[in-house]
Interface confidence: low
């Protein structure tokens, strides 16, 4: 019993003065607490607690369930205890069959003994099955058997407490161990879609999937830069023992422009946290934005091919697309396709393939697209570069030589005189008059140029060359002169 120096409060004394007492079932338990400041007796076993305000605790006919710790407390809060075993051959173990263990922690199989003098107090597997090889335990007759460092693999393990009583092995009722997994990784979070584009009034609904080893994972939808509480609904499933899934669905039944922003699904457990975001953009109405992939003014050589390409953003989805030239709609030669097969794609490509363009096929080519909210269009001005063609070359009644050429870009006409029969004309002749005939005509056709020189300046036989050229190429026509006496004759012009 405790002893302290005089003057200091001392713990109570218990009679009988032992730390443990063994009583046979049916016999009396009589415990006396000796203390001038006695307050109470307390009895504890498993989850049961009883109190007694009498300084003598008497149980006339002891039962196995009276096994436990009896504590006497005085007014100073000091206490002394005695542990009583009520030996009952028919009830060797007191049991609390609820058995939960946290992974990597110890857990107590609560099967205290009613007889401390039995041997081989241990754990056994049910139906003679062996316990896992790595399962270690520590027996304590007053408390039960502690399983050290519970493993996830022990989940649903069936076991008994066991002890040898008078040469026979006695088993307790069975226990089923339920293991609560430890979090050894952050939760896995994913979102149904990374971005949403909606019109005002449409419903926004997004689902976050949270996966972890148990349902005690915490999750919530948050809004970036806001503390506003969001309304969410949950569904959850256990796919096997340590495979838990929760779906948290956030819904805004009628989205507004000012609901636009970044929404975060956040999850955490004792190991750490994880998050995933989705972006919501709400527009007051749909839109179409067209981006030309080539210059909207196009120059192409006669006979060559050109592709007119646009990319465009359309929300909602485009419903009608067409390419138009001179009020005529193309039925073929074009294709329209989404830029990506992604479900949330809003970007598309349209291509018009113009092949072997003729000089007459220059002009405005227009792409038109519409959806349920808006229309949009873009125009390409196509110019076809053509080599000059000499349309006429004549000697006029007034003695002028005139050359008319057409092409694009606008041809330049130069004149040369070749004396005699030389074919290479080098001496240039200045024109008297140059006119662009259709400068005010249609903007995309060939440009026609007329140039004239005065033939009276030529005094010798020879050839006059009219040369029309532009960036694409050149063409020449020739006038032959022969003098008979004083008369000058124009011989057939030729190209």
């Amino acid at each position: 019993q405790p002893s302290v120096s005089p003057g200091e409060p001392s713990p109570p004394s218990i009679h009988p003065a032992k730390s443990e007492l063994i009583v046979r079932v049916g016999n009396e338990i009589r415990l006396l607490c000796i203390d001038p400041g006695f307050v109470k007796w307390t009895f504890e076993i498993l989850d049961e607690t009883n109190e007694n305000k009498q300084n003598e605790w008497i149980t006339e006919k002891a039962e196995a369930t009276n096994t436990g710790k009896y504590t006497c407390t005085n007014k100073h809060g000091l206490s002394s205890s005695i542990y009583v075993f009520v030996r009952d051959p028919a009830k060797l173990f007191l049991v609390d069959r609820s058995l939960y263990g946290k992974e990597d922690n110890d857990t107590l199989v609560r099967c205290p003994l009613t007889d401390p003098e039995v041997t081989s107090y241990s754990l056994k597997g049910c139906q003679g099955k062996p316990l896992p090889k790595d399962l270690r335990f520590v027996p304590d007759p007053k408390a039960g058997i502690t399983i050290k460092s519970v493993k996830r693999a022990y989940h649903r393990l069936c076991l008994h407490c066991s002890a040898d009583q008078e040469g026979k092995s006695v088993l307790s009722d069975k226990f089923i161990l339920k293991v609560r997994p430890a979090f050894k990784a952050v939760p896995v979070v994913s979102v149904s879609k990374a971005s949403y584009l909606l019109r005002e009034g449409e419903e926004f609904t997004v689902t976050c999937t949270i996966k972890d080893v148990s349902s005690s994972v915490y999750s919530t939808w948050k809004r970036e830069n806001s503390q506003t509480k969001l309304q969410e609904k949950y569904n959850s499933w256990h796919h096997g023992d340590f495979n838990y899934e929760r779906q948290a669905t956030l819904t805004i039944s009628s989205a507004r422009v000012n609901d636009s922003g970044v929404f975060m699904c956040y999850a955490n457990n004792t190991f750490g946290s994880a998050n995933v975001t989705t972006t919501l953009e709400v527009v007051d109405k749909g839109f179409i934005n067209i981006f030309p992939m080539i210059n909207t003014t196009v120059f192409v050589n006669d006979g060559e091919n050109v592709d007119l390409i646009v990319e465009y953003e359309a929300f909602p989805k485009p419903e009608h697309q067409q390419w138009i030239y001179m009020n005529r709609t193309f039925t073929d030669k074009w294709e329209d396709y989404p830029k990506s097969e992604n479900e949330s794609n809003i970007r598309y490509v349209s291509e018009l393939h113009l092949t072997r363009l003729k000089g007459t096929e220059g002009g405005t080519y227009t792409f038109l697209v519409s959806n349920s909210d808006v229309n949009a269009s873009i125009a390409f001005n196509v110019y076809v570069n053509t080599k000059p063609e000499i349309l006429t070359y004549d000697r006029l009644v007034n003695g002028m030589l005139q050359c008319v050429a057409a092409g694009f870009p606008e041809p330049t006409i130069d004149w040369y005189f070749c004396p005699g029969t030389e074919q290479r004309c080098s001496a240039s002749v200045l024109p008297v008059d140059v006119q662009t005939l259709n400068a005010s005509g249609p903007p995309f056709g060939k440009l026609v140029v007329q140039s004239s020189i005065d033939s009276s300046a030529f005094k010798h036989n020879g050839t006059v060359e009219c040369k029309a050229y532009n960036d694409v190429g050149k063409t020449s026509a020739y006038f032959n002169f022969a003098f008979k006496g004083n008369n000058k004759e124009q011989i057939h012009p030729h190209t």
């Epitope: 970036e224 806001s226 503390q227 506003t228 509480k229 636009s260 922003g261």
Partner: antibody, heavy 122, light 106 residues
Framework: EVQLVESGGGLVQPGGSLRLSCAAS????????MAWVRQAPGKGLEWVAS????????YYLDSVRGRFTISRDNAKNSLYLQMNSLRAEDTAVYYC???????????????WGQGTTVTVSS | DIQMTQSPSSLSASVGDRVTITCRAS??????LNWYQQKPGKAPKLLIY???RLQSGVPSRFSGSGSGTDFTLTISSLQPEDFATYYC????????FGGGTKVEIK
């Protein structure tokens, strides 16, 4: 009429304490974010502290963190600023301001009180 | 912390003038910018929030524009009651105000 009225300002010595109050009326106080903004003599505006209406989370200017405490009593429609260890540079007119939000993503201050003057001087 | 720089710090203008005040943030604040007007001895008054949205009761001669780091407050035709000090304020990361622009009578 929506109104904020500050009180509790005055002259205090360096190292001293003051408690400012802001009485709100004309709106549901518990629904709004609240803040304190100050203006030193001849200077510009400086946000000091704010408190969220839903979570009770508090935010402070670095130079006042640990010395000032913002709090609210929704039952009394009141906002408070407890100022300890006051310094000369805390001398200013202190305004109580109501926070409203656009798009639930950020706050602006749409209603202001007339201000209460705090002078820290020996 | 996000620093807000206003320019000019003061300007002189006449009634009917078009006045432009600029505000620059030390880092991108998206469109989270507010403008306030303050007259001597009075509390500030909210003019514009979220860069360009006019607070209820504010005359339409006030307008705001910009995004990212550069913002502008424009008074299309200055009125006698507009002579005051104007402050910009960011709401991206906590709150900070610009140094103010005083609009005086020329």
């Amino acid at each position: 009429e929506v109104q904020l009225v500050e009180s509790g300002g005055g002259l205090v010595q360096p190292g001293g304490s003051l408690r400012l109050s802001c009485a709100a009326s004309g709106f549901t106080f518990s629904d709004y974010y609240m803040a304190w903004v100050r203006q030193a003599p001849g200077k510009g505006l400086e946000w000091v502290a704010s408190i969220n209406q839903n979570t009770g989370s508090t935010y402070y200017l670095d130079s006042v963190r640990g010395r000032f405490t913002i709090s609210r009593d929704n039952a009394k429609n009141s906002l408070y600023l407890q100022m300890n260890s006051l310094r000369a540079e805390d001398t200013a007119v202190y305004y109580c301001a109501r926070g409203d939000y656009y798009g639930t993503t950020y706050w602006y201050f749409d209603v202001w009180g007339q201000g209460t003057t705090v002078t820290v001087s020996s | 912390d996000i620093q807000m720089t206003q320019s000019p710090s003061s300007l002189s203008a006449s009634v009917g003038d078009r006045v432009t005040i600029t505000c620059r943030a030390s880092q991108s604040i998206s469109s989270y910018l507010n403008w306030y007007q303050q007259k001597p001895g009075k509390a500030p008054k909210l003019l514009i929030y979220y860069t360009s949205r006019l607070q209820s009761g504010v005359p339409s001669r006030f307008s705001g524009s910009g995004s990212g780091t550069d913002f502008t407050l424009t008074i299309s035709s200055l009125q006698p009651e507009d002579f005051a000090t104007y402050y910009c304020q960011q709401g991206r990361r906590l709150w900070s105000f610009g140094g103010g622009t005083k609009v005086e009578i020329k």
